[in-house]
Interface confidence: medium
């Protein structure tokens, strides 16, 4: 069905990091262009990137609105100069997006470590609470002001000398291990919502060593 | 156990001063929005100003009806946040409460017992 | 600053009615709207954010509506344990209070 100078978009894909969230089609438009809309399950609908020759269109500041609502795309295709001509049901052709919730879905970044301090036998690990796109009242909210206790980190820590790895756990920003006196440690962490199905962790943050820039020392 | 105690409330004149405290326990208070909210006597709820967390540079916003008046700060080696009231009316007699603040849906998600600032001449 | 005028400031209903409280914003807030319910001696509680979000745990007799600058609360079968005073918050720009709704059992 519809026109025969369109074709409709397939392989709508969302792709999404720390709630910057694109929505991703296919093919590349030859004489159409395209429009998209995004809903929520009981919402209206609100069109986005109008009449693009684009394959993907940024929702970001709509699925910040409530990351906790389940959102629903779709891509309207129209003869390139002529959008008003429509498909043979009288409408645009179009195709629907898979359902998208962003708190349950979006991928967690890649984490740095901010800083680590050494006093004796033990160092205090901070990770850098990253920011997202979610904002509110003037500011964009941290990593921890949208998941809360649902997040954790996850820290990797190994002597410098050997590869063999210790993890410790933490529902803050902060961990404090033990480690020996006049040995050097490297370190990665790993952010993780233990409670999703899928996208749970996010990939290993650069490791960080002692004896580097990175690090505070005070041996007491 | 999330806990916040509010102390530092009583009777002031006009024009007067008084700082109230609120000290925090059982969560990492650095992680935190922390804000302040009131209650007159036989009236509503009034937000007064919130601190912002660590991530955010704990910035600070207020009312209206107290911006200049009014200052929030906390000192995290204590885990303690403050509201220093200065120039004080009769129509800011009210229960001082303070609360954590979820900055994302705006939750208020722990609340202090609250002190009553009485201000009279 | 923005606005919020909550009406009615009390009402009385029966158990099992459906009640509605209103609330309308100065300027246009999007749907950044919550509904708290506080009762006597404890801190109020979040039952509705962005207005129509149910907080986890919340029976589903609660709802909310509207958006822009007006917008509605509704218990759609009221039981003994709600009564308590009910405000809505705006969080669109800073924080602001309605001046809450007073409900009772008949």
């Known amino acids: 069905s519809g026109t025969t100078n369109t074709v409709a978009a397939y392989n709508l894909t969302w792709k999404s990091t720390n709630f910057k969230t694109i929505l991703e089609w296919e093919p590349k438009p030859v004489n159409q262009v395209y429009t998209v809309q995004i809903s929520t399950k009981s919402g209206d609908w609100k069109s986005k990137c109008f009449y693009t020759t684009d394959t993907e269109c940024d929702l970001t500041d709509e699925i910040v609105k409530d990351v906790k609502q389940t959102y629903l795309a779709r891509v309207f295709s129209y003869p390139a100069g002529n959008v008003e001509s429509t498909g043979s049901a009288g409408e645009p052709l179009y195709e629907n997006s898979p359902e998208f919730t962003p708190y349950l879905e979006t991928n967690l970044g890649q984490p740095t470590i901010q800083s680590f301090e050494q006093v004796g036998t033990k160092v205090n690990v901070t990770v850098e609470d990253e920011r997202t796109l979610v904002r509110r009242n003037n500011t964009f909210l941290s990593l921890r002001d949208v998941f809360g206790k649902d997040l954790i980190y996850t820290l990797y820590y190994w002597k410098s000398s050997s590869s063999g790895k210790k993890t410790a756990k933490t529902n803050t920003n902060e961990f404090l291990i033990d480690v020996d006196k006049g040995e050097n440690y490297c370190f990665s962490v790993q952010a993780v919502i233990p409670s999703r199905t899928v996208n749970r962790k996010s990939t290993d943050s650069p490791v960080e060593c002692m004896g580097q820039e990175k690090g505070e020392f005070r041996e007491i | 156990e999330v806990q916040l105690v509010e102390s530092g409330g009583g009777l002031v004149q006009p024009g007067g001063s008084l700082r109230l405290s609120c000290a925090a326990s059982g969560f990492t208070f650095t992680e935190y929005h922390m804000s302040w909210v009131r209650q007159a006597p036989g009236k509503g709820l009034e937000w007064v100003g919130f601190?912002?967390?660590?991530?955010?540079?704990?910035?600070?916003e207020y009312a209206a009806s107290v911006k200049g008046r009014f200052t929030i700060s906390r000192d995290n080696s204590k885990n303690s946040l403050y509201l220093q009231m200065n120039t004080l009316r009769t129509e800011d007699t009210a229960v001082y409460y303070c609360?954590?603040?979820?900055?994302?849906?705006?939750?208020?998600?722990?609340w202090g017992q609250g002190t009553l600032v009485t201000v009279s001449s | 600053a923005i606005q919020m005028t909550q009406s009615p400031s009390s009402l009385s209903a029966s158990v099992g009615e459906r009640v509605t409280i209103t609330c309308r914003a100065s300027?246009?807030?999007?749907?950044?709207l919550n509904w708290y319910q506080h009762k006597p001696g404890k801190g109020p509680k979040l039952l509705i954010y962005?207005?129509?979000t149910l907080q986890t745990g919340v029976p589903s007799r609660f709802s909310g509506s509207g958006s822009g600058t007006d917008f509605t609360f509704t218990v759609s079968n009221l039981q003994p344990e709600d009564i308590a005073t009910y405000y809505c918050?705006?969080?669109?720009?800073?924080?602001?209070f309605g001046q809450g709704t007073k409900l009772e059992i008949k």
């Open positions: 918050l705006q969080y669109d720009n800073l924080l602001t």
């Open positions: 609360a954590r603040l979820t900055m994302v849906v705006a939750e208020f998600d722990y």
């Open positions: 601190i912002r967390n660590r991530a955010q540079g704990y910035t600070t």
């Open positions: 962005y207005t129509s």
């Open positions: 300027q246009d807030i999007n749907k950044y």
